[in-house]
């Protein structure tokens, strides 16, 4: 049965952050694991993909990842399927929105002493806690003339008077994070002496060393005062500027100009308007420095003609958000057509060969521009330049079979011989252009060869038959030195093959004819009874019409084959005594004797003081020890043949004589006594 060792469990997740649903399975055989979301199979994407058996989220999405996930393990052989417990995400998020007028229906209907209700359109999960601000100053619940309904995200002013005039903003925070209103609401209830906002400064993003302008205007009767402050509460005037704001200018209309902006100038600027009566109005705007990071590299892509493919360009991080566009051959791609840009994606529909080339993704903002190229290859089915031809190849020489094709990308060529894939080794080599080289053609290379040329778009194949033109050669070549046993019958074979069956004949090397007792029968030299005079040099000649003739020289030696006159016997010796293993052989040429003891040749030059091999071939071992026990082999050899004979040597302890045994008692073994 399939068992889940680890099951996915429901969990909290943060919008845009990583997450992992774990799944681990144990089963008797292999299984494959896939995931369901609300009962439908989950397809891998760059954002959400299988990681082993688990499901990995690079960035949780509250819309696409809401629902029930389930891990399914299937044994495809038996068909058995097991399903994990359901798991879902409690996704925490927060999203900014504007401050809007809820009541009355329009700004034109706002009059002194009427009720005004504003709504904060910031939403999130879990439900965030809201904070209201007038002209940047927090409004606490229960203060005079206003109430805050957190559940309905409303701020109610009842009744609204001139003192309530100002710029209303809201912020909300939750376990996920914090957001402030994307658009604020200016409430204006006339009290001529109160300062009223005419123009509020906006957040500005500028490139380094560029200029930034904040506009700020208030109206009142009499005219109000206006003052600019930077983050650390330092006032900015044309007479007294802070050291880091030397290039700041305050205009008569209240606008603040900053030239050649540097990183230290970034921050919050406050514009304060004060009327003859009423509270000061504080408006805030932030100066951000534009920035843009580098773009990640693209892998080269290979597509097939007729398919639809997409290449995603991930924009670099930057402020403001960089705009992204695709170009090809220096021309910006349209937003529709066959090859077009959709969002950040390059889309190639019904791909054609002409679509191949370099496509560039551009990203730009105030801080600059970044670009990254992607090389797109359109794979084509290979076409023939030269097919393999039926060929006649000469044995022993290199042979070549062509398989020349062209395609994009460069095709892969494989060769088959008798339907079996040829793997490159010392005999076969496939060149870069697809040609097969057979390094040294052999007779059995005569068969069918098939080459297959492939790209991702498809493959073509062709076959050819190879006929091997056999060279004129001895099969096998006669041994150059051969021995014949004196006074015995002997044969010396000689055979050859070629394109045509060759004629084979023997002759003596000196050109003299063969004696009558020596016959040449279809290449086999036959000696009815070998004599000493038969020794000498002979030549085997093989010839045919198209290939001429070849010769093989053989030196025949007449020998008396080896026989043993004396062979070593099974021998038992008392420890400390001397063992003698006799061996004598005869033959012509006179044989040499070698001994092998306990599986190693006894080298006469390295025997040491205890061992000695006599001229006649006998082996003597003095002061024998138990480790000398074993099989000893006498090997007799000459230039014509070799023979061996063996016998065991046993080394035993000398028995202690018992009282009952007289001095004449025989030993318990057949012994050599010395």
């Amino acid at each position: 049965a399939i068992v889940f060792i680890k099951q996915p469990s429901s969990q909290d997740a943060l919008q845009g952050r990583r997450a992992l649903l774990r799944c681990e399975v144990e089963a008797p055989g292999p299984v494959h694991v896939y995931w369901l979301l609300d009962g439908a199979p989950v397809q891998d994407t760059e954002r959400r993909f299988a990681q082993g058996s688990s499901l990995s989220f690079a960035a949780v999405d509250r819309l696409q990842d809401s629902g029930t996930f389930q891990c399914v393990a299937r044994d495809d052989v038996t068909g058995e399927e097991a399903r994990s417990a359901n798991a879902s995400f409690n996704i925490k998020w927060i999203e900014a929105g504007p401050v809007v007028l809820k009541h009355p229906a329009s700004e034109a209907e706002i009059q002194p002493q009427t009720q005004v209700t504003l709504r904060c359109h910031i939403d999130g999960h879990p439900r965030p806690t809201y904070q209201w601000f007038r002209d940047g100053t927090p409004l606490s619940d229960g203060q005079s003339n206003h109430t805050v309904s957190s559940k309905e995200r409303n701020l109610t002013l009842r009744p609204a008077g001139p003192e309530h005039s100002g710029l209303y903003s809201c912020c909300a925070h939750s376990a996920f994070g914090q957001a402030c209103s994307s658009q604020n609401f200016t409430l204006s209830i006339a009290d001529e002496s109160f300062a009223r906002v005419v123009l509020a400064p906006q957040d500005v993003v500028v490139a380094r060393y560029e200029e930034a302008m904040f506009h700020c205007q208030f109206s009142a009767q009499p005219p109000p005062s206006l003052q600019w402050l930077f983050e650390d509460e330092t006032p900015i005037t044309n007479r007294s500027r802070p050291p880091h704001l030397r290039r700041a200018t305050v205009f008569a209309n209240g606008s603040l100009l900053l030239t050649q902006v540097r990183p230290r100038n970034a921050g919050i600027y406050r514009c304060i308007g004060q009327g003859q009566r009423g509270p000061p109005i504080i408006l805030e705007a932030t100066l951000h420095l534009a920035e843009i990071e580098d773009m990640p590299l693209f892998e080269p892509r290979v597509f097939t003609a007729g398919s639809e493919e997409r290449v995603t360009c991930l924009p670099p991080k930057g402020l403001p958000e960089p705009s992204v566009w695709w170009e090809h051959a220096g021309v910006r791609l349209p937003t529709h057509g066959r090859v077009y840009q959709k969002g950040h994606e390059l889309v190639l529909a019904n791909i054609a060969e002409s679509d191949a080339g370099v496509y560039t993704c551009h990203a730009a903002n105030l801080a600059g521009q970044r670009r990254q190229d992607v090389n797109i290859t359109v794979a084509t089915v290979p076409s023939w330049l030269k097919k393999p031809q039926d060929s006649q190849l000469e044995e022993g020489k290199p042979g070549y079979l062509d398989c020349l094709t062209q395609a994009t990308p460069k095709p892969t060529v494989v060769w088959y011989r008798n339907q079996m894939l040829i793997s490159e080794d010392s005999r076969f080599e496939v060149f870069k252009n697809g040609t097969l080289r057979i390094n040294s053609v052999e007779v059995y290379d005569g068969t069918w060869y098939r080459c297959m040329s492939s790209t991702p778009a498809g493959s073509i194949e062709a076959q050819a038959r190879v006929q091997v033109l056999e060279k004129l050669k001895f099969t096998p070549p006669p041994q150059p030195q051969q021995c014949m046993e004196f006074d015995k019958e002997a044969t010396v074979p000689c055979s050859a093959t070629g394109r045509e069956k060759p004629t084979i004949k023997w002759e003596r090397a000196d050109g003299s004819s063969l004696p009558e007792w020596v016959t040449d029968n279809a290449g086999t030299l036959h000696f009815a009874r070998v004599t000493r005079d038969d020794a000498g040099n002979y030549t085997c000649i093989a010839s045919n019409g198209p290939q001429g003739q070849i010769r093989a020289h053989v030196q025949l030696t007449v020998a008396v084959f080896i026989t043993f006159k004396v062979e070593p016997e099974r021998t038992t010796v008392y420890q400390g005594h001397t063992a003698l293993l006799q061996c004598e052989a005869q033959g012509d040429p006179k044989p040499l004797i070698q001994w092998k003891g306990k599986d190693r040749i006894l080298d006469p030059t390295k025997l040491g003081p205890r061992m000695h091999i006599f001229q006649n071939g006998s082996l003597v071992i003095h002061d024998v020890a138990p480790e000398d026990s074993g099989r000893y082999t006498c090997i007799a050899g000459n230039s014509c043949n070799i023979k061996h004979t063996e016998a065991p040597l046993y080394v035993v302890d000398k028995p202690v004589p018992e009282e009952s045994e007289g001095p004449g008692s025989p030993p318990p073994y057949k012994m050599i006594q010395t």
């Epitope: 494959h32 299937r74 495809d76 038996t78 068909g79």
Partner: antibody
Framework: EVQLVESGGGLVQPGGSLRLSCTAS????????MNWVRQAPGKGLEWVGI???????YYASWAKGRFTISRDTSKNTVYLQMNSLRAEDTAVYFC??????WGQGTLVTVSS | EIVMTQSPSTLSASVGDRVIITCQSS????????LAWYQQKPGKAPKLLIY???NLASGVPSRFSGSGSGAEFTLTISSLQPDDFATYYC??????????FGQGTKLTVL
């Protein structure tokens, strides 16, 4: 003994409908996936569709709309409902549990 | 639409030969390994030989072996036996619970 037996095959006119049954014995359908595969005379195997252990169904693109797989776990039987039949639907229809266990097949002939 | 292409479509060989059948898919199979090979003889249901690319099914001789990954796979019979002359099919499984068969390779006596 674990086995599968198909039934319901026979002669049907073009445009007609037929329901094939695959009765399982020796195991419970609710823990297994079941496939339908067909083989036209002298031709290769062709996957029709699958019903998984929860009863969800998936089909080959050519089978969507005309063919429907269902099951009755109380009868331990899987069905293949075939509508708007054509001459090219003539084949032996096999049901299979996973890759290993196959039924003997049932012949469907669509002809006028 | 997924297309699985087997090559060759027909193959003649002799007892003792080494035989290789290839299977190419138009897209990668699930987990790069969800591929099976079947043997079918006339009038019989298919018999599973190899599952998950290279695992030998129960009772299948060790002369059968499978290899590959992604979208390209091979079935090898190391030394052809008289009982091996039949039709062979590859079957791939894909994301979304979709399966497909190759068109088959008929192995006949040379």
């Amino acid at each position: 003994e674990v086995q599968l037996v198909e039934s319901g095959g026979g002669l049907v006119q073009p445009g007609g409908s037929l329901r094939l049954s695959c009765t399982a014995s020796g195991f419970s359908l609710s823990n297994y996936v079941m496939n339908w595969v067909r083989q036209a005379p002298g031709k290769g195997l062709e996957w029709v569709g699958i019903i998984d252990s929860s009863g969800s169904t998936y089909y080959a693109s050519w089978a969507k709309g005309r063919f429907t797989i269902s099951r009755d776990t109380s009868k331990n039987t899987v069905y293949l409902q075939m509508n708007s039949l054509r001459a090219e639907d003539t084949a032996v229809y096999f049901c299979a549990r996973g890759l290993y266990l196959w039924g003997q097949g049932t012949l469907v002939t669509v002809s006028s | 639409e997924i297309v699985m292409t087997q090559s060759p479509s027909t193959l003649s060989a002799s007892v003792g030969d080494r035989v290789i059948i290839t299977c190419q898919s138009s897209q990668s199979v699930h987990n790069n390994n969800l591929l099976a090979w079947y043997q079918q003889k006339p009038g019989k249901a298919p018999k599973l030989l190899i599952y998950y690319t290279s695992n030998l099914a129960s009772g299948v001789p060790s002369r059968f072996s499978g290899s590959g990954s992604g979208a390209e796979f091979t079935l090898t019979i190391s030394s052809l036996q008289p009982d091996d002359f039949a039709t062979y099919y590859c079957q791939g499984g894909y994301n979304g619970n979709i399966y497909a068969f190759g068109q088959g390779t008929k192995l006949t006596v040379l």
